[in-house]
């Protein structure tokens, strides 16, 4: 499965939006990489 910050952030954003949650602007998962590389 996708192992980058962007992938995981998008997945979490989708889950949270469906559950009424909010993703903080500065949220970055701590156990994945970065698409910016």
């Amino acid at each position: 499965s996708c192992n980058t910050a962007t992938c995981v952030t998008h997945r979490l954003a989708g889950l949270l939006s469906r559950s009424g949650g909010v993703v903080k602007d500065n949220f970055v998962p701590t156990n994945v990489g970065s698409e910016a590389f």
């Epitope: 980058t4 910050a5 500065n26 970055v28 910016a36």
Partner: antibody
Framework: EVQLVESGGGLVQPGGSLRLSCAAS????????ISWVRQAPGKGLEWVAE??????????HYAEAVKGRFTISRDNAKNSLYLQMNSLRAEDTAVYYC?????????????WGQGTLVTVSS | EIVLTQSPATLSLSPGERATLSCKAS??????VSWYQQKPGQAPRLLIY???NRYLGIPARFSGSGSGTDFTLTISSLEPEDFAVYYC?????????FGQGTKLEIK
């Protein structure tokens, strides 16, 4: 002006150690994730290691070829990145670049230094 | 690890021509592919990220496309300064990996 300046390269014997440094300026270093990428003479690019920002626990990842021999670290107060290289081998001979990057979500930043040459030879 | 295979190894074209460079991944990487340009004695420069997003200051003649396992970098009309080596990379999984490079040379 954004700058990443590597230093610490040189000639070292097989089995020896070397510590590379990367001095950053012109951007908020502490927010950036940093990797070392190397390029053997006349060859392609190879990712070596990554360290995340302090807010991301300064977590690290390594390529299999260097795991257990190389250690990446950072000092945000000094805007500096380090690569401690132990048990060096001939195949570690390369130009080593530090790369800083940051994902804003809608855009990114990606900065490379000019590299420092490491030669492992007897 | 994910292996990236670039083709052709060398591409010989003239200024003004269109260049098409290919990058194929051994496993699906969605759109997590970047393209870098490197000239002799210089550090690589990011051109494209996320498969199709031009990086800051990169001319519009550079474009990227693809998803899954097949990716393409297109230079619509070659300028003299475009002759260099081009690398694709993936950031979908660790370890980050690069293709072996395509050398774009003047015909």
């Amino acid at each position: 002006e954004v700058q990443l300046v590597e230093s610490g390269g040189g000639l070292v014997q097989p089995g020896g150690s070397l510590r590379l440094s990367c001095a950053a300026s012109g951007f908020t270093f502490s927010n950036y994730w940093i990797s070392w990428v190397r390029q053997a003479p006349g060859k392609g690019l190879e990712w070596v290691a990554e360290i995340r920002s302090e807010s991301d626990a300064s977590a690290t990842h390594y390529a299999e070829a260097v795991k257990g021999r190389f250690t990446i670290s950072r000092d945000n107060a000094k805007n500096s990145l380090y690569l401690q290289m132990n048990s060096l081998r001939a195949e570690d001979t390369a130009v080593y670049y530090c790369v800083g990057y940051f994902d804003y979500g809608l855009a990114i930043q990606n900065y490379w230094g000019q590299g420092t040459l490491v030669t492992v030879s007897s | 690890e994910i292996v990236l295979t670039q083709s052709p190894a060398t591409l010989s074209l003239s200024p003004g021509e269109r260049a098409t460079l290919s990058c194929k991944a051994s496993k699906r990487v969605t759109t997590y592919v970047s393209w870098y340009q490197q000239k002799p004695g210089q550090a690589p420069r990011l051109l494209i990220y996320g498969a199709s997003n031009r990086y800051l200051g990169i001319p519009a003649r550079f474009s990227g496309s693809g998803s899954g396992t097949d990716f393409t970098l297109t230079i619509s009309s070659l300028e003299p300064e475009d002759f260099a080596v081009y690398y694709c990379s993936q950031s979908y999984n660790y370890p980050y990996t690069f293709g072996q490079g395509t050398k774009l040379e003047i015909k």
